[in-house]
């Protein structure tokens, strides 16, 4: 019996087609992805093959203005239109709190939404009961297929699930649900979830009875043969894991942003054992036409987005200096504003010992592309912020050793004075540079804001300590020459859309007045500073 699994993950609000790098589509003839194009391909496969499942491994939420405006209603509407068979909850599905998941998505989705390792407690338990499930048994042709869901147990640190959801260890939670499916004589089981490729592989290895793992969160691109676009494969598709009980378990993921449609064919024997598995992600490029009816619906929904872009989010009473002359040479108040917004967006009081789990932010000055003038009645709009942050990136959470951070700050000023983009703006960090010293030895003081404290204060950076830092995904991926971040990071979780983070902060604050306040100091002559 042959099953075709079509899968997406980490689509992040890319409802419209995008450019090759998943940013805004500029030249339509070279654009990719989008739900209209995805639907064309899905329908083509559904017509050609008998037993097809369309699955999503989470993080549909968050990423473009579509989510900012429609808050998940767009996800439910278009996933319903594409007739998804099931979805696993990702961490970003909790970005607007539990209510922001229940009302727009859980109550509106015409497909089951799954997670076995999220347990509701207290008053939420009855409110959310039945709206998401640990598993679902789906009939496909003459057979049934069990799908068990899972979600990153780091979600409380990455999003806003509140205090009434408990995120259990994935493997511990999945095993009893798979066992239940076995007692229902369901012998073909897919684990569908959102915990990243490393956990996907562990699930394949450790959870008895799982036949296939369809994952997300780590935006992993797998491919067999010559890859069709810019993404470099992390391994073959499918990636085969040998389970502890000796089975070959295919593990798949389909990069992100709706650029590819994962396509996996599995052959099962009559006892539900996987005999063979093969496939590849399908690049959704312009050779695949956009479905006209879905496209028309997208265009109808788009109208509200254009109106939103020009509405006032809040006011500034000071000039927001986002000029390259400032932000690539010294502390600029636009950099401070953005970093403050980034920390504010990551306030998660999950432990009494910590005022917050993260206090530090770094931001490449070259990523700040425009100032905002206060003399326009102080008005700040989404359109203004899109000029400041035009790349459609995310502000991510990483864990780094102090030594890596020190290298990053050395890199920040290694060729100071040439208006290069790597000059770092900061939050929760005080840095002093001596630019008269040779490159690679210019950081003379680096103090960081404590987290395990009731009164936050600055302490010298410790080289061997592991720190959490919020930064643009561009830096996490080694952009602007920050290779040491990419190479040495201990953990990387993708965060919220950059503009959305700043716009939410401005809306919350109503009136802003960021200052230049001595976070970054530099001098060109020897001072008697102690090395740290």
């Amino acid at each position: 019996w042959e099953l075709t699994i079509l899968h997406t993950n980490d689509v992040h609000s890319r409802l419209e087609q995008t450019s090759e790098d998943s940013s805004k589509c500029v030249n339509a003839s070279r654009c990719m992805g989008g739900v209209a194009r995805l639907f064309t391909k899905v329908q083509q496969i559904r017509r050609a093959e008998p037993n097809v499942l369309l699955l999503d491994a989470g993080d549909q939420y968050q990423g473009t203005i579509w989510f900012t405006v429609y808050k998940g209603a767009e996800v439910a509407h278009f996933m319903n239109a594409l007739r998804y068979d099931a979805m696993a909850l990702g961490n970003h599905e909790f970005d607007n709190g539990v209510e922001g998941l229940i009302e727009p998505l859980l109550k509106e989705a015409k497909f089951p939404i799954l997670s076995a390792n999220i347990k509701a407690k207290g008053p939420l338990a009855s409110q959310i009961s039945g709206l998401y499930l640990p598993y679902k048994v789906l009939p496909v042709g003459d057979e049934v297929v069990g799908i068990v869901g899972y979600t990153s147990k780091e979600t409380p640190f990455l999003s806003n699930p509140g205090t009434n959801l408990v995120f259990e260890d994935e493997i511990t939670a999945l095993q009893p649900e798979v066992d239940k499916l076995k007692t229902l004589n369901v012998n073909k089981i897919i684990a569908l979830g959102h915990s990243g490729f490393e956990m996907d592989k562990l699930i394949a290895q450790k959870v008895r009875g799982v036949d296939v793992v369809v994952g997300g969160h780590s935006n992993t691109f797998l491919y067999t043969g010559n890859p069709p676009s810019k993404e470099v494969p992390a391994g073959k598709y499918p990636f085969i894991v040998t389970s502890d009980d000796g089975r070959k378990v295919p593990v798949v993921q389909a990069y992100a942003f709706g650029k590819y449609l994962g396509y996996l064919k599995i052959e099962f024997d009559e006892r539900g054992n996987v005999i063979s598995s093969h496939g590849n992600p399908i690049l959704l490029n312009s050779s695949i036409p956009e479905d006209p009816s879905i496209k028309a619906d997208i265009n109808k929904w788009r109208i509200k987005l254009d109106n939103y872009s020009t509405q006032e989010l809040g006011k500034t009473i000071v000039y927001l200096d986002g000029s390259s002359q400032s932000c690539r040479f010294r502390e600029c108040n636009m950099g401070n504003l953005i970093c403050d917004a980034m920390i504010n967006n990551n306030l998660r009081h999950t432990d009494e010992m910590f005022w917050n789990h993260v206090s530090m932010c770094i931001l490449n000055g070259g990523g700040i592309r425009s100032p905002i003038d206060e003399r326009n009645n102080g008005t700040i709009t989404w359109e203004n912020l899109a000029a400041v942050l035009p790349f459609g990136g995310t502000f991510d959470l990483v864990q780094l050793k102090g030594s890596t951070l020190k290298k990053a700050f050395e890199h920040s000023v290694h060729r100071y004075g040439q208006s290069t983009g790597e000059f770092l703006q900061v939050g929760g960090i005080h840095v002093v540079y001596d630019l008269s010293r040779k490159p690679g030895d210019r950081v003379v003081k680096l103090d960081v804001l404590c987290t395990k404290c009731r009164v936050p204060s600055y302490d010298p950076l410790k080289m061997d300590e592991v720190y959490k830092v919020i930064l643009p995904n561009f830096l996490a991926n080694g952009g602007d020459g920050f290779q040491m971040i990419k190479d040495e990071l201990l953990r990387h979780d993708s965060g919220d859309q950059d503009i959305n983070v700043v716009s939410t902060y401005i809306s919350k604050m109503k009136v802003i007045y960021p200052a230049v306040e001595g976070r970054i100091k530099a001098h060109h002559h020897h001072h008697h500073h102690h090395h740290h």
Partner: antibody, heavy 118, light 107 residues
Amino acid sequence: QVQLVQSGAEVKKPGASVKVSCKTSGYTFTNYYIYWVKQRPGQGLEWIGWIYPGNLNIKYNEKFKGRVTITADKSASTAYMELSSLRSEDTAVYYCARDDNYAWFAYWGQGTLVTVSS
Amino acid sequence: DIQMTQSPSSLSASVGDRVTITCKASQDVSTAVAWYQQKPGKSPKLLIYWTNTRHTGVPSRFSGSGSGTDHTLTISSLQPEDFATYYCQQHYSTPFTFGQGTKLEIK
């Protein structure tokens, strides 16, 4: 709350057909199976078949195959069971039921009595 | 098809009694057994599924046990509203099948 409301009692002649409806509310229709169950007067329960409205997959008990057709109208959140070439042994109460996660029948309609009599 | 044989087919008991109904499957059904209660002229009501999991709102006096081929429904202390017909069902494989019923009457 979850509700399944069935159409009213029917009296039919042998050889005729009957179509029983099951209108659902209080939940997402596409996300749960609808099962049909037969109960002859004073007798036990027999599973006729299912429909999964999400992908309109239908499975019949071999015993009922050929004369039973199960359908669903997603827009009306309603399932239907049609029984053709009626005979006297089809006289029974027909129930629709919903799962709460596959294979057991958590919520039931009130039943529809179909009487086949010449 | 899997046959489910219930016993007894009827039994008389008094309020406060402990009552046990058994169900034997013609082949191994693991723990995939449900129990229903039906009163005259009414639809069946789910009591227990997966052998021993009580459905929402079902009183704790109802319990289930067993695995493989032998399964049991126990009512620990009969209440007046418990007099009804009880059916077991295997939810292990299609076609899903029911026992022939056990009618519980007042002694």
